[in-house]
Amino acid sequence: QSGPLPKPSLQALPSSLVPLEKPVTLRCQGPPGVDLYRLEKLSSSRYQDQAVLFIPAMKRSLAGRYRCSYQNGSLWSLPSDQLELVATGVFAKPSLSAQPGPAVSSGGDVTLQCQTRYGFDQFALYKEGDPAPYKNPERWYRASFPIITVTAAHSGTYRCYSFSSRDPYLWSAPSDPLELVVTGTSVTPSRLPTEPPSPVAEFSEATAELTVSFTNEVFTTETSRSITASPKESDSPAGPARQYYTKGN
């Protein structure tokens, strides 16, 4: 065979979002009969010549970008797509709230606000149960994110995280869950574009906002890093979203 071997896949099980001290397995998958696998942590000298890395307890130092490749004979494969392994629960949870409220009729508007008391400049918003893993994460280190063809399918449970662009793989614990209830007819499930533009967003202190318009028109909104994944973690007890009010006694 001439040319490089096709790239393997690299995945984190059960999720690439890993609460501190919880286990995770990184698995490199190539074609049958591979002679040697190499799994490496980028920007470090760490690597291992095995297809599976089991991390029994997630640590801050293990968060970062990973990739793998394999060797057959004297040929090396192309490297896998990079996997971003994120440690969560490193910082205190942000607060997620809905304005004007978590119940909205189809065709109405709602704004989800993720707020932190710290200086974090990045936010991630998750809708529980979305099946697709997120891709191309670099594009989502943005303060803004468009939502296209938003529908009543946006009913569900949301959580947000906050983190700093200086340490993008160390995230807060998830916010308490926010249940968004949409009344009215259900239409086509919404899709998030994989390569969103990056308009400049204006922030009031450390707040990320997502405005969801429940209409059938294309509606571009400003939001935080918003990705579709379903992290199986419970860093904080479930409960109503914590509201932040104006400072006062």
């Epitope: 910082f91 205190a92 949870k93 707020q115 008391r117 710290y118 200086g119 974090f120 400049d121 303060a143 700093s164 662009s165 200086r166 614990a173 308490d176 967003a201 922030f203 009031s204 202190e205 450390a206 904080s236 007890p237 409960g239 914590r242 932040y244 009010y245 104006t246 400072k247 006062g248 006694n249």
Partner: antibody, heavy 119, light 113 residues
Amino acid sequence: QVQLQQPGAELVKPGASVKLSCKASGYTFTSYWMQWVKERPGQGLEWIGEIDPSDSYTNYNQKFKGKATLTVDTSSSTACMQLSSLTSEDSAVYYCARGAITTATLDYWGQGTTLTVSS
Amino acid sequence: DIVMTQSPSSLAMSVGQKVTMSCKSSQSLLNSNNQKNYLAWYQQKPGQSPKLLVYFASTRESGVPDRFIGSGSGTDFTLTISSVQAEDLADYFCQQHYITPLTFGAGTKLELK
């Protein structure tokens, strides 16, 4: 007005544990995080951790994990910090302080409890 | 952890003089989204607990006299007392509120001549 009341002093033997209290009044206890800070002469101020009284969620300085345990009793608007396996290094003034609502600053402080660890 | 370094460790001033003290952080405290610097100043008078003076580097806490002026950005910050009063004799601490663990400077002791 906002007040955070702490006992003036505690004397404890090495190896023992102690529970320091902080009674809040003058504001809605569950709306503000409670912070704890250690002060030793010549060592300045060290942040121990914080607790959200609305759901007892805690966030610790790694240095004090295993040493300090933060709890709250919302019925009496009291925050507590238990310190375990005490040594002379734990002798210090311990402050509780209310966390400002939109920033991680400490806008009201208790008078502090002087903890002395001595046999 | 972010290291906060204050200077000088002490200074002696006369009433009415202008006082300037410095605080440097080992990392930038500027949030690029909102252009706020997450730096606070506290005053601790002898035998008392600390009192919040300034947050976001330059926002005075309510009730704090306007002779206390916070300034700076990124990693270099200054607290200025435009005309020092006898009651300003105290230790002054800076604190970063950018990220946990929250960290404080070692303090500047203001003494009166």
